[in-house]
């Protein structure tokens, strides 16, 4: 019961987290114009990963998409990539975890398979959450760097006569949404991994099976092997991996640096 609750809660928390990551990625307010210690402008600037917007005090808002790909800063491209990787991994994780849920019965899927799927989705959620947190943190770092650079030359004078308002940008709502969502996805992933341990069938290495025969013959079966109860007429023996650990080809690969180019 506790395992089902942990798995279910992990799924719901991850679902909320991934929805948050998607929302943060789509939001326009990744960076907003800093209004502190600044002239009161009748224009408010804010920027997202995909477009920049200007809201006038008249209420009119105009947004322009970044129609260039090569002209964009490498850091922005990296953040985009991290967020997309996070969303993709999270979406796959959600799909896998649906089938892994203990409360959902699919055919005659055994607990070991569900345990493996739960672990897979858990790891996917963890990586997804880390991608989102990394993406948001990279963007935040970029903002902090630019903020202090623009503060250094807050007003650029032309012969000391004409002043130019230097627009400084600070953290937008999307950053906080991203951090929280990434954290939730991470927590959800950890919960799925914990649930996986409880789902895995705990079997002893050697099981003695006694038969009430006339003689004292006792048949034993090596605990390392188990008759398959999979789909179809497969009667071959499969190796049982204790604790639901996975084979090499099941291990989740992390995105390489080349994903961000």
């Amino acid at each position: 019961m506790a395992v089902t609750a942990c798995q279910g809660l992990g799924f719901v928390v991850s679902l909320i987290g991934i929805a948050g990551i998607i929302a943060a990625t789509c939001m326009d307010q990744w960076s907003t114009q800093d209004l502190y210690n600044n002239p009161v402008t009748a224009v408010f600037n804010y920027q997202g990963l995909w477009r920049s917007c200007v809201r006038e005090s008249s209420g009119f808002t105009e947004c322009r998409g970044y129609f260039t790909l090569l002209g964009l800063p490498a850091m922005l491209q990296a953040v985009r990539a991290l967020m997309i990787v996070g969303i993709v991994l999270g979406a796959i994780g959600l799909l896998v975890s649906i089938f892994a849920l203990k409360c959902i019965r699919i055919g005659s899927m055994e607990d070991s398979a569900k345990a493996n799927m739960t672990l897979t989705s858990g790891i996917m959620f963890i990586v997804s959450g880390l991608c989102a947190i990394a993406g948001v943190s990279v963007f935040a770092n970029m903002l902090v760097t630019n903020f202090w650079m623009s503060t250094a030359n807050m007003y650029t004078g032309m012969g000391g006569m004409v002043q130019t308002v230097q627009t400084r940008y600070t953290f937008g709502a999307a950053l906080f949404v991203g951090w929280v969502a990434g954290g939730l996805t991470l927590i959800g992933g950890v919960m799925m991994c914990i649930a996986c341990r409880g789902l895995a069938p705990e079997e002893t290495n050697y099981k003695a099976v006694s038969y009430h025969a006339s003689g004292h013959s006792v048949a034993y079966k090596p605990g390392g092997f188990k008759a398959s109860t999979g789909f179809g007429s497969n009667t071959k023996n499969k190796k049982i991996y204790d604790g639901g650990a996975r084979t090499e080809d099941e291990v989740q690969s992390y995105p390489s640096k080349h994903d961000y180019v």
Partner: antibody
């Protein structure tokens, strides 16, 4: 068509109060930023106050801050300017205007005259 | 506060003539976010409220004749009337619409010779 009609102006003694009204019609008043602008007897234009959409922000000219209050009644499509502690330099023709693209005042009323004199 | 300086204070012209008036701001009115200049031009005829001519320094308001053209960027702006007509005789004001307070220039009075 768009119409802005100001009222409430008149002669008032220094230190006195006055409430100006601006009845709007012909446009979506509740989703428009509105401003008060005054024109001095010397014909100088002076922006007085602005109220943005949804009561979010109000902005005032420094010399009227704390004395004037801009407000709106979206149900009745009316903009107000409550003026108190009036001074002789507040004497002017007061216009209410709608802010449009570029924060420009795209529609103006005919104005209401305010005279502060003892 | 941003100081708007208009020149000349008055202009005497003949009908059909090309007229240029200047407006300078003490601070740049260019917004980096959309690369637009928040400068507005108004026309005021005697006994009437001001009328919007040009916003964003160069965008003509609907219904405004094509002979009115706004130009400039940053701190220096110009209003040009390609061929003055009798109905254009008025006072022209420029306004900063970028930073509060939204200051106006003293105006340029257009008079007929």
């Amino acid at each position: 068509q768009v119409m802005l009609v100001e009222s409430g102006g008149g002669l008032v003694k220094p230190g006195g109060s006055l409430k100006l009204s601006c009845a709007a019609s012909g446009f979506a008043f509740s989703s428009s930023a509105m401003s008060w602008i005054r024109q001095t007897p010397e014909k100088r234009l002076e922006w007085v106050a602005t109220m943005t959409v949804g009561y979010i922000y109000t902005y005032y000219l420094d010399t009227v801050k704390g004395r004037f209050i801009i407000s709106r009644d979206n149900a009745n499509n009316t903009l107000y300017l409550q003026m108190s502690s009036l001074r002789s330099e507040d004497s002017a023709m007061y216009y209410c205007a709608r802010q449009g693209y570029g924060n420009a005042m795209d529609y103006w009323g005919q104005g209401t005259s305010v005279t502060v004199s003892s | 506060d941003i100081v708007m300086t208009q020149s000349p204070s008055s202009l005497t012209v003949t009908a059909g003539e090309k007229v240029t008036m200047s407006c300078k701001s003490s601070q740049s009115l260019l917004n980096s976010g959309n690369q637009k200049n928040y400068l507005t031009w108004y026309q005021q005829k005697p006994g009437q409220p001001p009328k919007l001519l040009i916003y964003w320094a160069s965008t003509r308001e609907s219904g405004v004749p094509y002979r009115f053209t706004g130009s400039g960027s940053g701190t220096d702006f110009t209003l040009t009337i390609s061929s003055v007509e009798a109905e254009d005789l008025a006072v022209y004001y420029c306004q900063n619409n970028y930073i509060y307070p939204l200051t106006f220039g003293a105006g340029t009075k257009l008079e007929l010779k």
